[in-house]
Interface confidence: low
């Protein structure tokens, strides 16, 4: 069963995934996709690395860790309810059926609505994580947020920005439903 991770609307979500390169710079291709890991590849790819670099990405999906050292944990910025669901981290080890597959369940909760402060503030927080040789760490250490920061300024400003219907539509429609051709 999938390990569950949580984040609130407007925050950044962090989905951990790690492997140990055989040698420094000897990277294994990795793909992240929305939906459970299929037999091969990733479905609905949102980010992909090759032996050297990130070669496919979209604007809200980032590798904030050092992927050259095997930290291929995914950060999804400014999440919406539509980002909820299963994500696949697939470490594409050469050889027939050698891939390591990890299904991670992301649960997005509505933001806690509080009266807008008289003076807008920025909040950042860091959460501990447990590095593992392969796969992901215990869920309780990875409950929400990105490393190194979470930006919560949207909570007090999102209501104003949502008056722009284009923003509202894009927050709903973009990001999690992108794939490579």
């Amino acid at each position: 069963s999938e390990v569950e991770y949580r984040a609130e609307v407007g925050q950044n979500a962090y989905l951990p995934c790690f492997y140990t390169p055989a040698a420094p710079g000897n990277l294994v291709p990795v793909c992240w996709g929305k939906g459970a890991c299929p037999v091969f590849e990733c479905g609905n790819v949102v980010l992909r690395t090759d032996e050297r670099d990130v070669n496919y990405w979209t604007s809200r999906y980032w590798l904030n860790g050092d992927f050259r050292k095997g930290d291929v944990s995914l950060t999804i910025e400014n999440v919406t309810l539509a980002d909820s669901g299963i994500y696949c981290c697939r470490i594409q080890i050469p050889g027939i059926m050698n891939d390591e597959k990890f299904n991670l369940k992301l649960v997005i909760k509505p933001a806690k609505v509080t009266p807008a402060p008289t003076r807008q503030r920025d909040f950042t927080a860091a959460f501990p994580r447990m590095l593992t040789t392969r796969g992901h760490g215990p869920a309780e250490t990875q409950t929400l947020g990105s490393l190194p920061d979470i930006n919560l300024t949207q909570i007090s400003t999102l209501a104003n920005e949502l008056r722009d219907s284009r923003l509202a539509n894009d927050l709903r429609d973009s990001g999690a439903t992108i794939r490579i051709g």
Epitope: S59, T153, E161, D170, G175, I178, G181
Partner: antibody, heavy 118, light 113 residues
């Protein structure tokens, strides 16, 4: 209203360096990924570099990899492009642009001209 | 990367007449799960930065006159100016945002005949 104002362009010799800045106002800067897009004289648009809202991740076009570095200071609402080892083919107007949604550009600055010539 | 090709490179149209610009992508930019085409159109007037006109292939940006419309799906797209006005003289670019890096067409110059 949204404003993006670039600065730092100018004439530089091949192999030289420049640092472009883009001062931003009118939206929550840290909530949006940003980009640099350039346009050589009389030519079309070319995406150069992008950075996530937090600044934690950056991506560059192959043509500038290893030479250009994009960064941002969210406390100053400013986007930067450090350009090293400049070549004649880097001559262009450089625009900073706000990335919206999946990766289109809903606001652009007026641009700053970079000329690389001996 | 996805290559975007526009046609024609330039066109001259009489005031009040229809102008049509085509854009072709080297691979589909339609994502079937949400039935959206990851394509935008920009207008760039002389000496000015580009301006977003249309995104998701057919959604007009706020404030853009309704004489501008976008259509098409998959790999073939069209920007139509239903009744050309003097202020529409510009270069128009398509851009895909389906797969990184984002890429633009080479541009189509629209002039008054």
């Amino acid at each position: 209203q949204v404003q993006l104002v670039e600065s730092g362009g100018g004439l530089v010799r091949p192999g030289g360096s420049l640092r472009l800045s883009c001062a931003v106002s009118g939206f929550t800067f840290s909530s949006y990924a940003m980009s640099w897009v350039r346009q050589a004289p009389g030519k079309g648009l070319e995406w150069v570099s992008g950075i996530s809202g937090s600044g934690g991740s950056t991506y560059n076009a192959d043509s500038v990899k290893g030479r250009f570095t994009i960064s941002r200071d969210n406390s100053k609402n400013t986007l930067y492009l450090q350009m090293n080892s400049l070549r004649a083919e880097d001559t262009a107007v450089y625009y900073c642009a706000k990335i919206f949604g999946s990766y289109y550009f809903d606001y652009w600055g007026q641009g700053t001209l970079v000329t690389v010539s001996s | 990367e996805i290559v975007m090709t526009q046609s024609p490179d330039s066109l001259a149209v009489s005031l009040g007449e229809r102008a049509t610009i085509n854009c072709k992508s080297s691979q589909s930019v339609l994502y079937s799960s949400n039935n959206k085409n990851y394509l935008a159109w920009y207008q760039q007037k002389s000496g000015q930065p580009p301006k977003l006109l249309i995104y998701w292939a057919s959604t007009r940006e706020s404030g853009v006159p309704d004489r501008f419309s976008g259509s098409g799906s998959g790999t073939d797209f069209t920007l139509t100016i239903s009744s050309l006005q003097a202020e529409d003289v510009a270069v128009y670019y398509c851009q895909q945002y389906y797969s990184g890096p984002p890429t633009f067409g080479q541009g189509t110059k629209v002039e008054i005949k």
